[in-house]
């Protein structure tokens, strides 16, 4: 895949993921009422990061915002913060990546500047995706904990009042926003990784690295640690064979002999 294509695709994937993160953050269905015990409920509850809603059989839907900050669970605040951080980093990442795109010419910006910007945006997208994935996972964990706690309460509390009056406890399960968030976070992360990969291809070899000749086994072997230029005849799957100790072993051989650096 060419550098431009990889960079462009990374940008598009990140953009889709970022849009998904915004959608998930705004969605009201982070947790939805568990209908296992009552699949034909006339009142359906669901909650988001910012408000809780009730939808009745009549079609009437009422949503109430969480107008307090202090009264909210710390975990919910943390999830909100993570999602907002993810969005902010995503916005910055998009702005940076627009200028970094190889297909867009801005003034006399050289490839090395574009490479740095591509790497920066890639890292921003990766962090943004991670923030979203962590945020959604923390919320999901909170739901699972509460679900089992309320299930335990439900079965332990049935004996009270001689079993005459039952209190139906509302349990919540995963809402659509969690799945949107996980997928969106994953896409943003993948897009960011693609941007970072594209950065390697954008790096001009001769400006960053000098070709050095090593005398090895009577041969002159040019060793270039940098990535390949798109203009060279090498395919993207061609491996760099580093020559160690006068050509005694290649990088492939090294993998079968663990060193102290293999276990960090």
């Amino acid at each position: 895949m060419s550098v431009t294509a990889c960079q462009g695709l990374g940008f598009v994937v990140s953009l889709i993921g970022f849009a998904g993160i915004i959608a998930a953050t705004c969605m009201d269905q982070w947790s939805t009422q568990d209908l296992y015990n009552n699949p034909v409920t006339a009142v359906f509850n669901y909650q988001g990061l910012w408000r809780s809603c009730v939808r009745e059989s009549s079609g009437f839907t009422e949503c109430r915002g969480y107008f307090t900050l202090l009264g909210l669970p710390a975990m919910l605040q943390a999830v909100r913060a993570l999602m907002i951080v993810g969005i902010v980093l995503g916005v910055i990442g998009i702005l940076v990546s627009i200028f970094a795109l190889k297909c867009i010419r801005i003034g006399s910006m050289d490839d090395s500047a574009k490479a740095k910007m591509t790497l920066t945006s890639g890292i921003l997208f990766i962090i943004s995706g991670i923030c979203a994935i962590i945020g959604v996972s923390v919320f999901a964990n909170m739901l699972v904990t509460n679900f089992w706690m309320s299930t335990a309460n439900m079965y332990s509390g049935m004996g009270g009042m001689g079993g005459m009056v039952q209190t139906v406890q509302t349990r919540y399960t995963f809402g659509a926003a969690l799945f949107v968030g996980w997928v969106a976070g994953g896409l943003t992360l993948i897009g960011g990784v693609m941007m970072c990969i594209a950065c390697r291809g954008l790096t001009p070899d001769d400006s960053n690295f000098k070709a050095v000749s090593y005398h090895a086994s009577g041969q002159n072997v040019a060793y270039r640690p940098g990535g390949f230029k798109a203009s060279t005849g090498f395919g993207s799957n061609t491996r760099n064979k580093k020559i160690y100790d006068g050509g005694a072993r290649t990088e492939d051989d090294e993998q079968s002999h663990p060193t102290k650096y293999d276990y960090v």
């Epitope: 009422q33 009552n38 034909v40 409920t41 006339a42 009142v43 509850n45 669901y46 909650q47 809780s52 809603c53 009730v54 009745e56 059989s57 009549s58 079609g59 009437f60 009422e62 109430r64 009056v165 039952q166 209190t167 139906v168 406890q169 509302t170």
Partner: antibody
């Protein structure tokens, strides 16, 4: 002015079928969940069926499940109740109702009488 | 199914008197999501269909006189008529609107002395 007018009631033998209709006017029919409620000769009220706004969900009590079918024709602003395998305990005055917030029934038709007798 | 129990089954009152009737449900009708009780009160006069009075246990339907007041939460509910008028003579029904199947109480009949 909201109006619900039921029709289709009458005398039917046990095991027979009957289709009730409810013509709605004075409101946007497509925007409301509709229900059928019956009142027995002993004056007890019994909920019979509910159809959600889009018509995609229908609900019934166990006493009529599999025998009664609620449906709606939004183009005709009409609610229906298809009743089959009728029993003597289905004898009642059948009302067409509109659901509003709180799942409350704010408008009721005048009712149509169904008598199941041999 | 949620069982609705109304008491008393009938009440004999004089005009201007304050009347209270109760409705008990076998399960809580309080929805935790919006802290609302899904209980409705209806009034049925002879030869007429029921008429909505109170929804969400305490919200008065528009056009209903303010002498009608609904109260209660969870499983115990009350309908109060502060000063009974001749036109209030009817049967009053409570209904569970919280979960299917919707169920009605047997009714409380209000009669004049």
């Amino acid at each position: 002015d909201v109006k619900l007018v039921e029709s289709g009631g009458g005398l039917v033998k046990p095991g027979g079928s009957l289709k009730l209709s409810c013509a709605a006017s004075g409101f946007t029919f497509t925007s409301y969940t509709m229900s059928w409620v019956r009142q027995t000769p002993e004056k007890r009220l019994e909920w019979v069926a509910t159809i959600i706004i889009g018509g995609s969900y229908t609900y019934y009590p166990d006493s009529v499940k599999g025998r009664f079918t609620i449906s709606r024709d939004n183009a005709k602003n009409t609610l229906y109740l298809q009743m089959s395998s009728l029993k003597s305990e289905d004898t009642a005055m059948y009302y067409c109702t509109r659901l509003v917030k709180g799942n409350a029934m704010d408008y009721w038709g005048q009712g149509t009488s169904v008598t199941v007798s041999s | 199914d949620i069982l609705m129990t109304q008491s008393p089954s009938s009440l004999t009152v004089t005009a201007g008197e304050k009347v209270t009737m109760t409705c008990k449900s076998s399960q809580s009708l309080l929805n935790s999501g919006n802290q609302k009780n899904y209980l409705t009160w209806y009034q049925q006069k002879p030869g007429q269909p029921p008429k909505l009075l109170i929804y969400w246990a305490s919200s008065r339907e528009s056009g209903v006189p303010d002498r009608f007041t609904g109260s209660g939460s969870g499983t115990d509910f009350t309908l109060t008529i502060s000063s009974v008028q001749a036109e209030d003579l009817a049967v009053y029904y409570c209904q569970n609107d919280y979960s299917y199947p919707f169920t009605f109480g047997a009714g409380t009949k209000l009669e004049l002395k």
